[in-house]
């Protein structure tokens, strides 16, 4: 673990309420082939344990999902995965929007601090699949 | 090697018979830029041969694609990774659907063991492209 | 960095000109959350400066898009990821089109050598978008 | 097994239309394209275009557009093609296909064909 | 539209002989990794049977003295050793980009 490998794959445990668009997250074996290793969960959101360059990456599918249920949405549903805290911190480091899709995936490399939290904000009134193939978000540390 | 690098990138060989919904790959350097250096191909499937968490991606065209082509199935065209053998151990990865789209590229974090066969099938009735370019699949070793 | 853990993740600098494709890039700490370290930019492409095996990443959005925007294009909006010199060594190693979304986003493994210039060809008639959590341009080396 | 069976032939005046069918069995209707190609007497074949069945989705050759019209009945799991206008150039037979496994334009099976012969 | 160009118009080969037919198309046909070329045989008063999809593979039920090859542009159909029953004409399709084209038909006569 003093190399620094922190690494995280989660899956999605449930949405927020209403006015909140974040995903809550959960990792772990025992759930399934997600898990933490360095990285921690704070109330379903990801919390980075240490500092270095990550690769950051996600998938999002919607449930019961077809070209016509995103396309007919005058305001498309958009997920951005951002550093939520700390306040100070706070940025978008990645946003794709649905558009005639029912699947997002992307990834970037970003430097991470220790104590940021990255949240996914899902805006919309679709919901994303729970499926573990289909929805997934992780961070693995790639170099200081 | 004896750092557990294990990786490979694949280019597309040729899809199965018409109840087969696997793609057959192949690597090495005399192909193009695909290349196998641990992972192992047996009869097309990729197999493991270091435990480890590793960085799978994908990526996969529909050849002589236009929005049309897809969008006119009512049964769409869809992407599945998984460990399909040893089968106690079998489960789906990673699943993309083509929806109104041309391509589907994701990736994702996932502990793999010794001996896991990985497939990917492509189930519906559009061929994938065999450019080099446009599909490929990889994996990648990143910590024990 | 003896170690060579060369990396690069760039945002979208501008668009060339009107019969040139290429995308060109920036990055630095100063410019957001890009930053080079080892690869290097030349006239806002990107070039290696480590022979190895590269995860090279990249997603684009295009500017004010939506469905429409890309549907009623005749010829397709396309992105390739290629290396465009030296010239002996030129190839495309990632194309993916836009169809009937506005934004694409992929990755790959390949092998890379020092000198190799990356080119990232926009073609069609739509702009990218400059925000840099929609646009960015990465490569990540992973093993001799 | 998969038989496409077309209605019989006809003749017809110049100026008029004509309606042929092409009868699906052996599969699902729905899920296959069915594509409609003319061949004159002694002469190559030319795609006139396509149905999707379950969407009625139409691709037309544009030699063909505002001449033939394609639709068909999901109930009877029939396809149909209309001719409008006929001159003597539309005496041919048409024939309707359906592609193979895979969903591109290549034909693997054949209804035997309707010969349309105008003639005033 | 692509326009595929048959040679000969006609020839007459032998029983148990080798029938080569070709077919040229104004441009390429090839794509995603493919060569998109088809070929049917035609006997008179009967529908077009396919034999040959993606320029060589064979049809189910189809012999195995048919066989196609050819990429990019040109293409060839050969039937060999020819029998009795393969005196038909024979049509290539293209299937790249719509529409779809056939070439003008080879008739095959057997000696």
């Known amino acids: 673990e003093s190399l620094g490998w922190d690494i995280a794959e989660l899956q999605l445990n449930h949405t927020g309420p209403q006015q909140d668009p974040r995903l809550y997250w959960q990792g772990g074996p025992a759930l399934g082939r997600s898990f933490l290793r360095g990285p921690e969960l704070d109330k379903g959101q990801l919390r980075i344990r240490r500092d270095g360059i990550y690769m950051v990456h996600i998938q999002v599918t919607l449930a019961i999902c077809s070209s016509t249920s995103t396309s007919r949405h005058h305001h498309p549903t958009t997920l951005a995965v951002g550093i939520c805290s700390p306040a100070s911190r706070s940025i978008s480091l990645l946003r794709l929007s649905f558009h005639q899709g029912c699947t997002i995936a992307s990834q970037r490399l970003t430097p991470l601090a220790r104590g940021d939290t990255l949240c996914t904000n899902l805006t919309g009134t679709l919901l994303p699949s729970r499926n573990t193939d289909e929805t997934f978000f992780g961070v693995q540390w790639v170099r200081p | 090697e004896s750092l557990g690098w294990d990786i490979a990138e694949l280019q597309l060989n040729h899809t199965g018979p018409q109840q087969d919904p696997r793609l057959y790959w192949q690597g090495g350097p005399a192909l193009g830029r695909s290349f196998l250096r641990g992972p192992e191909l047996d009869k097309g499937q990729l197999r493991i041969r270091r435990d480890g968490i590793y960085m799978v991606h994908i990526q996969v065209t529909l050849a002589i694609c236009s929005s049309t082509s897809t969008s006119r199935h009512h049964h769409p065209t869809t992407l599945a990774v998984g460990i399909c053998s040893p089968a106690s151990r079998s489960i789906s990865l990673l699943r993309l659907s083509f929806h109104q789209g041309c391509t589907i590229a994701s990736q994702r974090l996932t502990p793999l063991a010794r001996g896991d066969t990985l497939c990917t099938n492509l189930t519906g009735t559009l061929l994938p492209s065999r450019n080099t370019d446009e599909t490929f699949f990889g994996v990648q070793w990143v910590r024990p | 960095e003896s170690l060579g853990w060369d990396i690069a993740e760039l945002q979208l600098n501008h668009t060339g000109p009107q019969q040139d494709p290429r995308l060109y890039w920036q990055g630095g700490p100063a410019l957001g959350r890009s930053f080079l370290r080892g690869p290097e930019l030349d006239k806002g492409q990107l070039r290696i400066r480590r022979d190895g095996i590269y995860m090279v990443h990249i997603q684009v959005t295009l500017a004010i898009c939506s469905s429409t925007s890309t549907s009623r294009h005749h010829h397709p909006t396309t992105l390739a990821v290629g290396i465009c010199s030296p010239a002996s060594r030129s190839i495309s190693l990632l194309r993916l089109s836009f169809h009937q979304g506005c934004t694409i986003a992929s990755q790959r493994l390949t092998p890379l050598a020092r000198g190799d210039t990356l080119c990232t060809n926009l073609t069609g008639t739509l702009l990218p978008s400059r925000n840099t959590d929609e646009t960015f341009f990465g490569v990540q080396w992973v093993r001799p | 097994e998969v038989q496409l069976q077309q209605s019989g032939p006809e003749l017809v005046k110049p100026g008029a239309s004509v309606k042929m069918s092409c009868k699906a069995s052996g599969y699902t209707f729905t899920d296959y394209v069915i594509h409609w190609v003319k061949q004159k007497p002694g002469q190559g074949l030319e795609w006139i275009g396509y149905l999707h069945p379950y969407n009625d989705d139409t691709k037309y050759n544009e030699k063909f557009k505002g001449k033939a019209t394609l639709t068909s009945d999901k109930s009877s799991s029939t396809a149909y093609m209309e001719l409008s206008s006929l001159t003597s150039e539309d005496s041919a037979v048409y024939y309707c296909?359906?592609?193979?496994?895979?969903?591109?334009?290549?034909?693997?099976?054949w209804g035997q064909g309707t010969l349309v012969t105008v003639s005033a | 539209d692509i326009v595929l160009t048959q040679s000969p118009a006609s020839l007459a080969v032998s029983l148990g002989q080798r029938a080569t037919i070709s077919c040229r198309a104004s441009?390429?046909?090839?794509?995603?990794?493919?060569?998109?070329i088809h070929w049917y045989q035609q006997k008179p008063r009967q529908a077009p049977k396919l034999l040959i999809y993606?320029?060589?593979n064979l049809e189910s039920g189809v012999p195995a003295r048919f066989s196609g090859s050819g990429s990019g542009t040109d293409f060839t159909l050969n039937i060999h050793p020819v029998e009795e029953e393969d005196a038909a004409t024979y049509y290539c399709q293209h299937s790249r980009e719509l529409p779809p084209t056939f070439g003008g038909g080879t008739k095959l006569e057997i000696k």
């Open positions: 993606l320029a060589s």
């Open positions: 296909a359906r592609r193979g496994y895979y969903d591109y334009a290549w034909f693997a099976d």
């Open positions: 441009k390429s046909v090839s794509a995603s990794g493919y060569t998109w």
